[in-house]
């Protein structure tokens, strides 16, 4: 695994091929999670930010930007969308958490919580995922669509199997995240596929 501190994945072009596979040994279904990362893109169309599919289950967990100021979370093919006033184009720190017992999903954009939404109460997110950055999966690890591809930079990605309290979300935003037990930017197992370049993070 690699310590990617101070670095980003750069997706320099629109494509149907360029992506990064993130590898995790996640063996048990997720009842809760928090996902945080930084992104910088000047796309005004919709695109996938984080695509997590399991065998036979599309959009098991998907973070998707619908348009400027609109972020969606899919859990088990169900969707909620939260809105925020944001500058465009501008770097953004995104966290999203979801809790099975309540179904509550919450986005945090640049350290500010958006309106909580609810979906898939009681559902468990399946384990043994294929996790893809840069493309939106329509199958288990494949079937990409150019019109949903990400062009830009992604870094500081962490994923925990718990709902982090606000002070830990703010720590991640400020650049001092807790150690993460699903995906950790400081100890990341990944595979680059296609034209994706690792470069220094210069926009934080």
């Amino acid at each position: 695994h690699t310590d990617l501190s101070g670095k980003v994945f750069v997706f320099p072009r629109e494509s149907v091929t360029d992506h990064v596979n993130l590898i995790t040994p996640l063996e048990k279904p997720l009842q809760n999670f928090t996902l945080c990362f930084r992104a910088y893109s000047d796309l005004s169309r919709a695109y996938s930010l984080f695509s997590y599919n399991t065998q036979g289950r599309d959009n098991e967990l998907l973070v998707y930007k619908e348009r400027v100021g609109e972020y969606s979370l899919y859990i088990g093919r169900h969707k909620v969308t939260s809105k925020v006033i944001e500058k465009f184009p501008a770097p953004v720190h995104i966290c999203v958490s979801w809790e099975s017992s309540s179904g509550i999903a919450e986005f945090w954009i640049n350290g500010t919580p958006l309106v909580k939404k609810g979906l898939r109460q009681g559902y468990f997110v399946e384990a043994q995922p294929k996790i893809v950055l840069g493309q939106e999966q329509d199958s288990y690890g494949g079937k990409f669509d150019r019109s949903q591809s990400f062009v830009g930079e992604i870094g500081d990605l962490y994923m925990w199997d718990s709902v982090l309290p606000p002070e830990n979300i703010l720590s991640a935003y400020q650049g001092t995240p807790l150690p993460a037990n699903i995906l950790d930017w400081q100890a990341l197992n990944y595979e680059i596929r296609g034209y994706v370049i690792i470069k220094p993070l210069v926009w934080v």
């Epitope: 101070g6 037990n181 400081q186 100890a187």
Partner: antibody, heavy 119, light 107 residues
Framework: QVQLVQSGAEVKKPGSSVKVSCKAS????????MHWVRQAPGQGLEWIGM????????NYNEKFKSRATLTVDKSTSTAYMELSSLRSEDTAVYYC????????????WGQGTLVTVSS | DIQMTQSPSSLSASVGDRVTITCKAS??????VAWYQQKPGKAPKLLIY???YRYSGVPSRFSGSGSGTDFTLTISSLQPEDFATYYC?????????FGQGTKLEIK
């Protein structure tokens, strides 16, 4: 097999420094965080800090931040822990330990280095 | 810093006994807890990670459970080689912290 071999025991005077080495073999040294943990005689375990050999990124326990320095030599697959301004309470066995593949646990440990601080 | 409090601090038991050691965290650490075994003059060995997963090569008589603040290590049937000191460790927050240890002795 995966192994961490540490340097031998040291006796130091109060106020001096000690540098303990940890030579890795049997795996890709630059791909795993290396941690340092100490154990005072008859006491529990205390985390000092960690270093990633490739990025040389470090993270220290606040308690040791001003006195501990973690370094690596990639060419020899060796990690080092230097502790300065030694006092008698620094007498302990110092261990290096490798971070597990996917989790923040320690799956391979060195044999330990006893550092005795005495005037 | 998160305090990890183990109990008991020492324990006498016989071969074949079922033994339980507990570890209490001073705040929520989710399931980010490991258990180590240490014998005199040796380095610790990883037994259990993520509260309940046995590390490779660890006998099935060792099991772990718990989440949040309360964790348990159970040895279902003590073997002679199990007499040692056991430590819990949290890696939910920096700095990583350990319990003070539980010394398991032969009765």
């Amino acid at each position: 097999q995966v192994q961490l071999v540490q340097s031998g025991a040291e006796v130091k005077k109060p106020g001096s420094s000690v540098k303990v080495s940890c030579k890795a073999s049997g795996y890709t040294f630059t791909s795993y965080w290396m941690h340092w943990v100490r154990q005072a005689p008859g006491q529990g375990l205390e985390w000092i800090g960690m270093i990633h050999p490739n990025s040389v990124n470090t993270n220290y326990n606040e308690k040791f931040k001003s006195r501990a320095t973690l370094t690596v030599d990639k060419s020899t697959s060796t990690a080092y822990m230097e502790l300065s301004s030694l006092r008698s309470e620094d007498t302990a066995v110092y261990y290096c330990a490798r971070r597990n593949d996917y989790y923040w646990y320690f799956d391979v440990w060195g044999q330990g280095t006893l550092v005795t601080v005495s005037s | 810093d998160i305090q990890m409090t183990q109990s008991p601090s020492s324990l006498s038991a016989s071969v074949g006994d079922r033994v339980t050691i507990t570890c209490k965290a001073s705040q929520n650490v989710n399931s980010n807890v490991a258990w180590y075994q240490q014998k005199p003059g040796k380095a610790p060995k990883l037994l259990i990670y993520s509260a309940s997963y046995r590390y490779s090569g660890v006998p099935s008589r060792f099991s772990g459970s718990g989440s949040g603040t309360d964790f348990t290590l159970t040895i279902s049937s003590l073997q002679p080689e199990d007499f040692a000191t056991y430590y819990c460790q949290q890696c939910n927050n920096y700095p990583f912290t350990f319990g003070q240890g539980t010394k398991l002795e032969i009765k």
